[in-house]
């Protein structure tokens, strides 16, 4: 998930040279930007979140807000400061005319301004509930640990906290920030106001139909009786949680955001800050049958984003729409006809559908995992959720063709045992945003802060690409893929792993002069090869076929085309061992795969040769997939032969550590 490329509108209002009487001018050359929701009906013009630069203190935020008011007043405009943010993001929420945006963007400390917009509950039916008794024998599901050490925050509608399913499990906080209901004839019926939140609280921690039956919850009201809220209200809710966490630190926290709005830079930024403060955020992917990257908080990389599947593990259809999909989704979970507490009466149950329900399942699973292992980091939790998911059970034909490769084929499941996964080397695949079609376009895939980038590959549907390379950015390795002339764009694919005490570096060999191809190996003592990448400047790599098999005794070697530079990812970590596994097919084939065996984890996936008919390579779970152009276009020459190269690793150190614990 990337939060830098959502299809949202960015209006950069250039700073005028005269400073309009400001005491402090913004730093030279910086231009604050204005953002608004790309979905016009969801915009809320007249209310703006002014986000200040990261190190801005509360007193400076208040001073900047007052300055805006004073300068607006001099121009004859009334403004109202609705809230001053601190704790998560510095800034303030202001009600003002859009005419003042240019003025506001020139204020000192301003980083960007975002127009407020709507967010919505992600369940259907919202009001067509049917009362149903629970459909299963409750005693079939008795989890070993019900999440009792974890607190789950729910940002949703009001809830009926004394419903028999959740009574005593949910503490209703005094937080409320909701917009007025639409329509003059709207009748505020209590049971409808509570419907969405009550159901989700039941799915997370309900006595009889809940996932984490021991989890305690706290509810914040950010959605009104129509299931509608605002980005600003959600931000203030997230800030409330952060302040509560600081005032009274408790055990692990899970925040459930069963809502979605258009792409929002500020909402994603707030989620990132909260996640970096050690909070696990789980959100609905959205019910728009669309790319989840176009919605927030679903597009925030630090958030665990959940799509919805049904009892047959198929993507959920919701009327004419359905679950969102794409690279910003982490995994799917049950989200159709989910039984839970109904606010219609204190003992009623109802079925609801949507990505909200799916997210509630994952929040419950997360609570149970964290209760069993309270020290888990967000990265460790996400990797475990992925690891224990059911793989390759979703019918991908439901997704648009261009999204199938990007969408994870994973359905959340409870681990068979909440303990004992510590020995595993966990890895996941992270796809970048699409680079776009320009000649020099690149795409970047990043791992989470406490994950290691162990390999980097690229993929282009047209096959026109110039490979990929690992490079340092801000003290961390990233994976960058390069588009080629005439290409429709590329994706970078990072293999992100949990490898404690790892020391990784990239060794590069420039294009070889000799016809034998380019080679590079890990020459440092104790370093093992975890991934190979190749990058070339020429537009077309021709048909040169390097030797595929490595010389004996050279397992730590990457081999590539003589016109390409080759990059080896070399890592040293306690007990880390890796091996190269290849699968070559002499005849042309659209897809070649090679998988790591049980107990080994795929860290690297690449293709040999790197010629232009190879579309690219990527990891799907523990399998390396190499895709080539349609067989009919390549003919059956030897040029069509492709080898998939997997690097499989395991950590003896992790295995020993877990045995010592048991």
């Amino acid at each position: 998930q990337e939060d830098e490329d959502g299809d949202y509108e960015e209006l950069v209002l250039a700073l005028r040279s005269e400073e309009d009487g400001l005491a402090e001018a913004p730093e030279h050359g910086t231009t604050a930007t204005f953002h608004r929701c790309a979905k016009d009906p969801w915009r809320l013009p007249g209310t703006y979140v002014v986000v200040l630069k990261e190190e801005t203190h509360l007193s400076q935020s208040e001073r900047t807000a007052r300055r805006l008011q004073a300068q607006a007043a001099r121009r004859g405009y009334l403004t109202k400061i609705l809230h001053v943010f601190h704790g998560l993001l510095p800034g303030f929420l202001v009600k003002m005319s859009g005419d003042l945006l240019e003025l506001a963007l020139k204020l000192p400390h301003v980083d960007y301004i975002e127009e407020d917009s709507s967010v919505f509950a992600q369940s259907i039916p919202w009001n067509l509930e049917r009362i149903t008794p629970p459909r299963y024998r409750a005693d079939e599901y008795q989890p070993p640990d019900g999440g009792s050490l974890v607190e789950v925050y729910l940002l949703d509608t009001s809830i009926q906290s004394d419903h028999r399913e959740i009574e005593g499990r949910v503490m209703v906080t005094d937080f409320e920030n909701v917009p007025e209901e639409d329509g003059t004839r709207f009748h505020r019926q209590a049971s409808k106001c509570d419907s969405h939140g009550t159901h989700l609280a039941g799915v997370v921690s309900g006595r009889d139909a809940g996932v984490a039956k021991g989890a305690s919850m706290r509810s914040l009201r950010v959605l009104n009786c129509q299931g509608k809220g605002t980005v600003s209200g959600t931000l203030i809710g997230l800030e409330f949680i952060r302040k509560s966490q600081l005032v009274q630190p408790v055990g692990p926290l899970v925040v459930l955001l069963p809502l979605a709005g258009g792409y929002s830079r500020v909402l994603n930024a707030a989620c990132q800050r909260l996640a970096r403060a050690g909070v696990v955020l789980v959100t609905a992917a959205g019910n728009f049958r669309d790319d989840a990257c176009l919605y927030s908080p679903a597009s925030a990389p630090e958030v665990i984003t959940v799509g919805a599947t049904n009892a047959q593990d198929q993507p959920v259809t919701l009327g004419t729409l359905g679950t969102n999909f794409g690279r910003c989704v982490d995994l799917f979970a049950p989200g159709e006809d989910i039984i839970g507490a109904s606010s219609d009466c204190s003992t009623c149950f109802v079925s609801q559908s949507g990505t909200s329900q799916a997210a509630a399942h994952v929040a419950g699973i997360a609570a149970m995992m964290l209760s069993a292992e309270p020290e888990l980091t967000l990265a460790e939790l996400r990797q475990r959720l992925i690891h224990f998911s059911a793989k390759d059970v979703i019918n991908e034909a439901w997704f648009p063709e261009d999204q199938r490769v990007l969408t994870p084929n994973l359905v959340a499941a409870l681990p068979p045992s909440t303990h004992g996964a510590g020995w595993q080397l966990f890895c996941r695949t992270v796809w970048s945003a699409h680079s776009g079609p320009t000649r020099m376009a690149t795409a970047v895939a990043r791992c989470a802060p406490d994950e290691e980038l162990l390999s980097c590959s690229s993929f282009s549907r047209s096959g026109k690409r110039r490979g990929e390379r690992m490079e340092a950015q801000g003290g961390k390795l990233v994976c960058r893929a390069h588009n080629a002339f005439g290409g429709e764009g590329v994706y970078a694919i990072a293999r992100c792993c949990l490898l404690p005490q790892a020391n990784c570096s990239v060794h590069t060999a420039p294009p070889a002069e000799a016809s034998m191809g380019t080679r590079v190996h890990c020459h440092q003592q104790g370093h093992v090869l975890t991934g190979c990448s190749s990058h070339w400047e020429v537009e077309d790599l021709g048909t040169h076929k390097p030797p595929v098999l490595r010389p004996r005794g050279q397992p730590n070697q990457c081999v590539g085309h003589r016109e390409a530079s080759i990059h080896a990812s070399c890592c040293h970590a306690p007990g880390l061992e890796c091996k190269v596994k290849e699968h070559g097919i002499p005849a042309p084939q659209e897809q070649v795969t090679v998988a790591c065996e049980e107990g080994w984890t795929l860290t690297g996936c690449s293709a040999l040769p790197g010629t232009s008919h190879v579309l690219g390579a990527y990891a799907v779970d523990n399998t390396c997939v190499v895709r080539s152009r349609d067989v009919s276009t390549t003919g059956s020459t030897s040029e069509g032969a492709v080898t998939a190269v997997a690097i499989c690793c395991r950590s003896r150190h992790l295995a020993q550590a877990s045995q010592e614990l048991q």
Epitope: P134, R137, D139, Q160, E167, G168, M171, S346
Partner: antibody
Framework: QVQLVQSGAEVKKPGASVKVSCKAS????????ISWVRQAPGQGLEWMGW????????NYAQKFQGRVTMTTDTSTSTAYMELRSLRSDDTAVYYC????????WGQGTTVTVSS | QSALTQPASVSGSPGQSITISCTGT?????????VSWYQQHPGKAPKRMIY???NRPSGVSNRFSGSKSGNTASLTISGLQAEDEADYYC?????????FGGGTKLTVL
Amino acid sequence: QVQLVQSGAEVKKPGASVKVSCKASGYSFTSYGISWVRQAPGQGLEWMGWVSAYNGNTNYAQKFQGRVTMTTDTSTSTAYMELRSLRSDDTAVYYCARGYVMDVWGQGTTVTVSS
Amino acid sequence: QSALTQPASVSGSPGQSITISCTGTSSDVGAYNSVSWYQQHPGKAPKRMIYEVSNRPSGVSNRFSGSKSGNTASLTISGLQAEDEADYYCSSYTSTNMVFGGGTKLTVL
């Protein structure tokens, strides 16, 4: 600490009504409903019904439907149970308990119905 | 709603273990996790000893444990002590209400 304190003993004539109160303290009153349970002399416990402190909704046992009214007053964190058309077999100790979970009980109110 | 079925009385000597059963149907005990057990001493209000089949509230001795199989729940008291002599009631959710067992008188010999 969490406490439920009930009103004192009552003696009523057949056909009359009785209203028992139950004052809650030590917790967020609207987070739980209040259950009412009675126990006739030498008999077991009998669940009468439940009232929501959140929205006033009620759930009565079929046996008492039409004869019982359960209410709450959030301003004083107090729940009330009124039983009408009393008969001699309504003589019992009436308990309030916190929620359906019934994790905390009042001390009980003895209601004697006698002519 | 008819009451859940409990034995009218059980007895045991100090230090022994006893088990009290509570039999319902697939619409109450069998359908829900919410089986509770209450202890009542003469002239006192009931006290919750076990909730949600097998959970013990804080302050309740670990000599008390609960379990469930199908439509029958059980309360086991190990290492019987004189102060355990009391009436014991089980309760369960039904689809719309709550139901109690008829009660079991435990005598410590």
